[in-house]
Amino acid sequence: AKLGAVYTEGGFVEGVNKKLGLLGDSVDIFKGIPFAAPTKALENPQPHPGWQGTLKAKNFKKRCLQATITQDSTYGDEDCLYLNIWVPQGRKQVSRDLPVMIWIYGGAFLMGSGHGANFLNNYLYDGEEIATRGNVIVVTFNYRVGPLGFLSTGDANLPGNYGLRDQHMAIAWVKRNIAAFGGDPNNITLFGESAGGASVSLQTLSPYNKGLIRRAISQSGVALSPWVIQKNPLFWAKKVAEKVGCPVGDAARMAQCLKVTDPRALTLAYKVPLAGLEYPMLHYVGFVPVIDGDFIPADPINLYANAADIDYIAGTNNMDGHIFASIDMPAINKGNKKVTEEDFYKLVSEFTITKGLRGAKTTFDVYTESWAQDPSQENKKKTVVDFETDVLFLVPTEIALAQHRANAKSAKTYAYLFSHPSRMPVYPKWVGADHADDIQYVFGKPFATPTGYRPQDRTVSKAMIAYWTNFAKTGDPNMGDSAVPTHWEPYTTENSGYLEITKKMGSSSMKRSLRTNFLRYWTLTYLALPTVTDQEATPVPPTGDSEATPVPPTGDSETAPVPPTGDSGAPPVPPTGDSGAPPVPPTGDSGAPPVPPTGDSGAPPVPPTGDSGAPPVPPTGDSGAPPVPPTGDSGAPPVPPTGDSGAPPVPPTGDAGPPPVPPTGDSGAPPVPPTGDSGAPPVTPTGDSETAPVPPTGDSGAPPVPPTGDSEAAPVPPTDDSKEAQMPAVIRF
């Protein structure tokens, strides 16, 4: 069966029907359907006016305008808001009421595209394998990134979050139109990785998406990750304004000037330094989402009630921090270079700057405890990776899972740890699953390009597609049309259970309490440390080119996690079980919840980089030479050669780009207040809203207030002798 021309709100569209095998199955593929009008710089997206005739939707459209990997030129286009759809078809009747999975790509909110990195015409985010193996509709789309997607003055002049609003427009378009493609508009699952995983999380929390999203999957990124929310957008807006010659004294004049500046100049005015960093990449974040008082009405920690009815999977890769650690400390990947205590202490102190000397020392002591028994370089390097994995990914993800669980009514919560090791041969053997290593398996690359992979990789891919698509169908990763290797139990605050995804999965893959002593440390001990306000605690921006200037964390405001407001439904921290490692006793009378103990976490794998972040797909054959990086719009990472290649594959370049950089410190600029009176829902903006906003929980524009004794969210009674406590909002470093 095949769809032929499909009528959408914009008009008729015609894709391509691709036959699969000899049994008559096929997949209808639509590429390049507009879901919004061509964008205007630094303006909200607007609906597409439509077209006459039948639109031929047969080729991917250009990505949104962004800097190339070398950051000296741009590629892509301002006219970029297009989506792509894969619809599986059986032999006889056209598909109906299929679950819908919408992918949101990562790339540090700075780069990426809906089709992903390309090698030999194989696009990373090609939805065919997921669609046909899982019998679901897959949708991918472009959204604006970098300054054009996220520049903000922190007020109504340039509220920001344009890229998030693009994402929302795509979701709302799918809701209105997917039935015509055979999809069930009442069963939409968002999934995404890194900045895409954080975007998924933010979309579930935004009042604009009420009623649009049924389920969500965040891979290596959640709204609470420290690199997701920019607390000082005005600082970065001024940096760009200075670069392009706009006045910075008056925000309104600056905004008007920026809107009429060449978008390419705006894009190139922000560069992420990738070498010789004076501070961790964390401090160089520029253009990411903001709390605008409208689309993101309050700190994400206070918005979890908005996601209470959405089934949720969240997880990380066991060495998600590897790529970042190797940028912050290049010795990590060099066998002949050593990591010293001084190096690590310096790194720790830069991450814990707002807690001053005590923060650095305590954190250093906790992480180096194993160094006395095992002073090997491998152990030290793993420690650095674990530290960045914890801070940037694991701890925020655990808090997000606990928040979701505590607010959820009938909705389910599931946690995972992806531990299938990286296939990048240039990495040391101890490296586990790096950032973005999971993507290739979710998108079925071991099946799409089988010569580049081993049977064990296909085992992992088959399992992930089965869990992900079952979840999209039923809300339970175990139930659906696809067999799974072992039962994945829901995450609860009692068990803190997570599934470890490896090549050999069985009943022992269900584990509990991941890295509890470290989770406990961050949410209890570290939080309770006093925040320092003296000048020494503030990093001095490096001199030289402004693009390398980190935002100094300011004062003590918001650096420590703030407990959620009264009825935010902030969950208590899951009680700990019998953790293998003794929890670090909290200092002081911390209001933060105890963290569950870790189980037997296993060594984490490391993911590849790339627009996708996904690991490169190896070329077929046993190439004797390293693959040449692809050219063109793809910017995709090359694929490592298979077989007994004489040379190691070239590490992926292209739109992999820098990993997402977490924002630091607190914003000097207040969030844009919601329109109307804060208890009421924000007034729906004209044009792009697409969904009536739900009133933000709590006092939207204002900083969260610590809950009072009779907070309506009753904490779950902790087990053992842990103190009853509220989960912290977000750990700010």
């Epitope: 032929g4 021309a5 499909v6 009528y7 959408t8 709100e9 914009g10 008009g11 008729f12 015609e14 609906p47 597409h48 006016p49 439509g50 077209w51 006459q52 005739g53 039948t54 709302a172 378009w173 809701k175 209105r176 139109n177 039935a179 015509a180 009623g211 649009l212 004209t686 809203s689 697409e690 969904t691 009536a692």
Partner: antibody, heavy 119, light 105 residues
Framework: QVQLVQSGAEVKKPGASVKVSCKAS????????MHWVRQAPGQGLEWMGV????????SYAQKFKGRVTMTRDTSTSTVYMELSSLRSEDTAVYYC????????????WGQGTLVTVSS | DIQMTQSPSSLSASVGDRVTITCRAS?????LNWYQQKPGKAPKLLIY???RLPSGVPSRFSGSGSGTDFTLTISSLQPEDFATYYC????????FGQGTKLEIK
């Protein structure tokens, strides 16, 4: 100027079929989608489906799938709507309407064709 | 299908009055169109894309809204404005509101 002229009123028995025509003039026939909308006596408007006269692509409202067929004849700039298995509740005025621009604002309407289904 | 709910279903007003008709969509929509229909006649496009007026439509008609809530406003009623008004959403399966009959008081 744009004109849409529909065929005359019809009286049909239950179970029969009716075919209503809509002749377009004053514009390039193949450049704009044509929709069919009906209105039962004293009731509101109900969208039935759309045809692209350029390539003949059609889309029908779920309610009418299996009973309605829309076709076009580019040589005479005419679109047709055939509704089968008629029942008394199909008694209505049937309108053809052309897109105004872009998609779906129905900017130009035929005068309507009354179809009465009665035994 | 997307549901469109118009209110009021009927209203009485006098020449010169300012009149507002609302249309609520569930779930949210991108654009809304408004039509005017007089007895025995075909509907006429009044406003498209939420707020735009086709040529020939008097400027006393205006439209606004986004997401789920939309309004049609007639700033100063004229005798020829007494008619039935319909809203319509565009999606892959367009639907109309049930209509608002505007009568002379």
């Amino acid at each position: 100027q744009v004109q849409l002229v529909q065929s005359g009123a019809e009286v049909k028995k239950p179970g029969a079929s009716v075919k209503v025509s809509c002749k377009a003039s004053g514009y390039t026939f193949t450049s704009y989608n044509m929709h069919w909308v009906r209105q039962a006596p004293g009731q509101g408007l109900e969208w039935m489906g759309v045809i692209n006269p350029g390539d003949g692509a059609t889309s029908y409202a779920q309610k009418f799938k299996g009973r309605v067929t829309m076709t076009r004849d580019t040589s005479t700039s005419t679109v047709y709507m055939e509704l089968s298995s008629l029942r008394s509740e199909d008694t209505a005025v049937y309108y053809c309407a052309r897109d105004y621009y872009g998609s779906s604002p129905l900017g130009y309407w035929g005068q309507g064709t009354l179809v009465t289904v009665s035994s | 299908d997307i549901q469109m709910t118009q209110s009021p279903s009927s209203l009485s007003a006098s020449v010169g009055d300012r009149v507002t008709i609302t249309c609520r969509a569930s779930p949210s929509i991108s654009y809304l169109n408004w039509y005017q229909q007089k007895p025995g006649k075909a509907p006429k496009l009044l406003i498209y894309a939420t707020s735009r007026l086709p040529s020939g439509v008097p400027s006393r008609f205006s439209g606004s809204g986004s997401g789920t809530d939309f309004t049609l406003t007639i700033s100063s009623l004229q005798p020829e404005d007494f008619a039935t008004y319909y809203c319509q959403q565009r999606s892959s399966s367009p639907t109309f509101g049930q209509g608002t009959k505007l009568e002379i008081k």
